[in-house]
């Protein structure tokens, strides 16, 4: 008799998920000397232990604690770049500006970036058919809880000036429901963080508006100010030029506004 399987609304676990996590771990630890001590098999075992045999709508931050412990990593707290809805540009930036870090430049973020995973209650199987969707099924699913956990820890670690890259092409440049808006903003520590500086990335070639005056940015400023953290905002009118100038700051065209 075929066993009944829960059909979720979201895509299933990424193909070759165990191999991918293990391979990413090995690659990461090879090029980050400070993480060479990490045993990638133990990391995979802890990752697996967080969701295997558990109901995929009943995952808690506690489930991920063994993985968090193994993946503990110190990044310079004053070199943190947060982002919302503009991941690729944030990653292009830290690929050039090597002393700054997004969450996905840390081991745990790197391991899980772009992947989906879930298990099934009371079986050791990984579900490759479907996984819970955050909106349509449940919020306490393995992927959402993972990102909430690592994002909270990442924000808590930040100090001095924290930068956030925001997508100026979105209707809500700052979205209270994004991971940045719902988790990271509220876990910046006022006793450590002096300023949150937003970089609003423009999408249109001829877009010369001051998007720092956008109502959602004003809402972000209000939330941050109430937490006793200063707020500043910059328009990045030309993201392509911005990246070029990060690569070649001495270029004569880089003295003008970007």
């Amino acid at each position: 008799v075929p066993r009944w399987r829960q059909q979720w609304s979201g895509p299933g676990t990424t193909k070759r998920f165990p191999e991918t996590v293990l391979a990413r771990c090995v690659k990461y630890t090879e090029i980050h000397p400070e993480m060479r001590h990490v045993d990638c098999q133990s990391v995979w075992d802890a990752f697996k232990g967080a969701f295997i045999s558990k109901h995929p709508c009943n995952i808690t931050e506690e489930d991920y604690q063994p993985l968090m412990k193994l993946g503990t990593q110190t990044v310079p707290c004053n070199k943190i770049l947060l982002w919302s809805r503009i991941k690729d540009l944030a990653h292009q930036f830290t690929q050039v500006q090597r002393d700054m870090f997004t969450l996905e430049d840390t081991l745990l973020g790197y391991l899980a970036d772009d992947l989906t995973w879930c298990g099934e209650f009371n079986t050791s199987k990984i579900n490759y058919q479907s996984c819970p969707d955050w909106r349509k099924d449940c919020s306490n699913n393995p992927v959402s809880v993972f990102w909430k956990t690592v994002s909270r820890r990442f924000a808590e670690a930040a100090c001095d000036v924290v930068h956030v890259m925001l997508n100026g092409s979105r209707s809500k440049i700052f979205d209270k429901n994004s991971t940045f808006g719902s988790v990271e903003v509220h876990n910046l520590q006022p006793e450590k963080v002096q300023t949150l500086e937003a970089w609003v990335i423009h999408g249109g070639r001829e877009d010369s508006r001051d998007l720092c005056q956008d109502p959602t940015i004003k809402e972000l400023e209000s939330i941050i100010s109430k937490r006793n953290i200063q707020f500043s905002c910059k328009n990045i009118y030309r993201p392509d030029k911005f990246l070029q100038c990060v690569k070649n700051p001495e270029d004569s065209s880089c003295t003008s506004e970007i």
Epitope: R24, L89, H91, Y110, D114
Partner: nanobody, 125 residues
Framework: QLQLQESGPGLVKPSETLSLTCTVS??????????WGWIRQPPGKGLEWIGS???????YYNPSLKSRVTISADTSKNQFSLKLNSVTATDTAEYYC?????????????????WGQGTLVTVSS
Amino acid sequence: QLQLQESGPGLVKPSETLSLTCTVSGGSISSSLFYWGWIRQPPGKGLEWIGSIHDSGSTYYNPSLKSRVTISADTSKNQFSLKLNSVTATDTAEYYCARGPRGFYSSGPDDFDIWGQGTLVTVSS
């Protein structure tokens, strides 16, 4: 959610050209962060890397297939394509498009971490 989807004819005649396209959704192929590639698996055999492309336009091919392979990208459609000339029955395989991990050159089946579902191509008259 990043997804890759292969498309193209499932049957190709010997000596003709096999053409496949990979459509990427949930991410951009022009971000300069990744290598995108093609891998195949003949029935009952292991995975074989065919080639990779980077958004700079650089392409890298398996030496054993280099003379017959072209990989190209169309960033406006967020697609990359495979052309394999002068096919024979030995080119019958499941063909996969895939993305390499950020920050690493990808030149073997184990170097890729996000995969399409695969499409079976049979070479037969």
